[in-house]
């Protein structure tokens, strides 16, 4: 089982849309795939895919999940808020027929505020 995640870095404006993609591949077929998205180590959602369908369509605040055969799991954040900034990781595990698991690399999401002055103040507030 292999998982490829993208993009590595994503910078979007507050109120717009962010799309994170996870490509899940396995040489042999699987009956049930458990997937998980985390943000800064905290679980956003942990649905499974079976018979070509996701058991859950929502994933965290303003997050929508979709599965496009053969291998694309998409997390769409819309609208994006400042709280969405963080490090996202996609994880997958084949539960049936045999346990296999893998995870993607981090996607770092940066959300710019609508007000550019707010952005300047935020950057200036970092120490040192």
């Amino acid at each position: 089982l292999s998982v490829q995640q993208g993009p590595n870095l994503l910078q979007v404006r507050q109120g717009s849309q962010a799309t994170l993609v996870c490509q899940v591949d396995q040489a042999t077929a699987w009956e049930r795939l458990r997937v998980k998205w985390t943000k800064d180590g905290a679980i956003l959602c942990q649905p499974y895919i079976t018979n070509g369908s996701l058991s859950l369509g929502v994933c965290g605040p303003q997050g929508r999940l979709s599965w496009q055969a053969p291998s694309h799991l998409t997390l769409q954040l819309d609208p994006v808020s400042l709280n969405h900034s963080g490090a996202y990781v996609c994880w997958a595990a084949v539960e049936i027929p045999e346990l296999e698991e893998a995870e993607g690399n981090i996607t770092r999401l940066f959300v710019d505020p609508d007000d550019p002055t707010q952005n300047r103040n935020r950057i200036a507030s970092f120490p040192g």
Partner: antibody, heavy 120, light 113 residues
Framework: QVQLQESGPGLVKPSQTLSLTCTVS??????????WSWIRQHPGKGLEWIGY???????YYNPSLKSRVTISVDTSKNQFSLKLSSVTAADTAVYYC????????????WGQGTLVTVSS | DIVMTQTPLSLPVTPGEPASISCRSS????????????LNWYLQKPGQSPKLLIY???TRLSGVPDRFSGSGSGTDFTLKISRVEAEDVGDYFC?????????FGDGTRLEIK
Amino acid sequence: QVQLQESGPGLVKPSQTLSLTCTVSGFSITTGGYYWSWIRQHPGKGLEWIGYIYTSGRTYYNPSLKSRVTISVDTSKNQFSLKLSSVTAADTAVYYCADMADKGGWFAYWGQGTLVTVSS
Amino acid sequence: DIVMTQTPLSLPVTPGEPASISCRSSQSLFSSNTKRNYLNWYLQKPGQSPKLLIYHASTRLSGVPDRFSGSGSGTDFTLKISRVEAEDVGDYFCQQHYETPLTFGDGTRLEIK
């Protein structure tokens, strides 16, 4: 250009262990998402999957041979190996190494094959 | 284990004529999760190792002549050669990768009449 090359003795005595090595060039066997495989073909017959080892080191064997097979990897030499114990004349075959990727599921590159004869 | 049954075992063909090889699996090779058939076709020319022709039942590998085509879904698959050429001689194998153990058909030997 990815190339695979089998090497090992062409003659093995019954009850002994058959040992073959596959040297991979043009590609690192530590690359994620690949299965390094062994397949054999009895003279004038079809193909039989022996097993493979995944990038993670996990092995998968054909149940018909599982008790006698070991597949391992030597990353420092970019090689993977097959050991088949307690051989009999029925193990006489051309042995191929090949690779398979998660993003496919087919055997993309094959070695040229090496004939191993089991005879005293 | 999934049993792959190929017919015919031998196929004599006149150059320029079409050829068809059938492959049947003992269980479905179609996944509703990935919408794929886990079935490949290989050609093994005399004295050579097998080479992939078709993957996922119907996708031709880049560089494979378009006279080769694959079709079918579930348990019944077909490899067709629209106009056989002398260089097409060899053994054709189907292979399933739906599950382990991976299994091959017994092969079809294509020969020129």
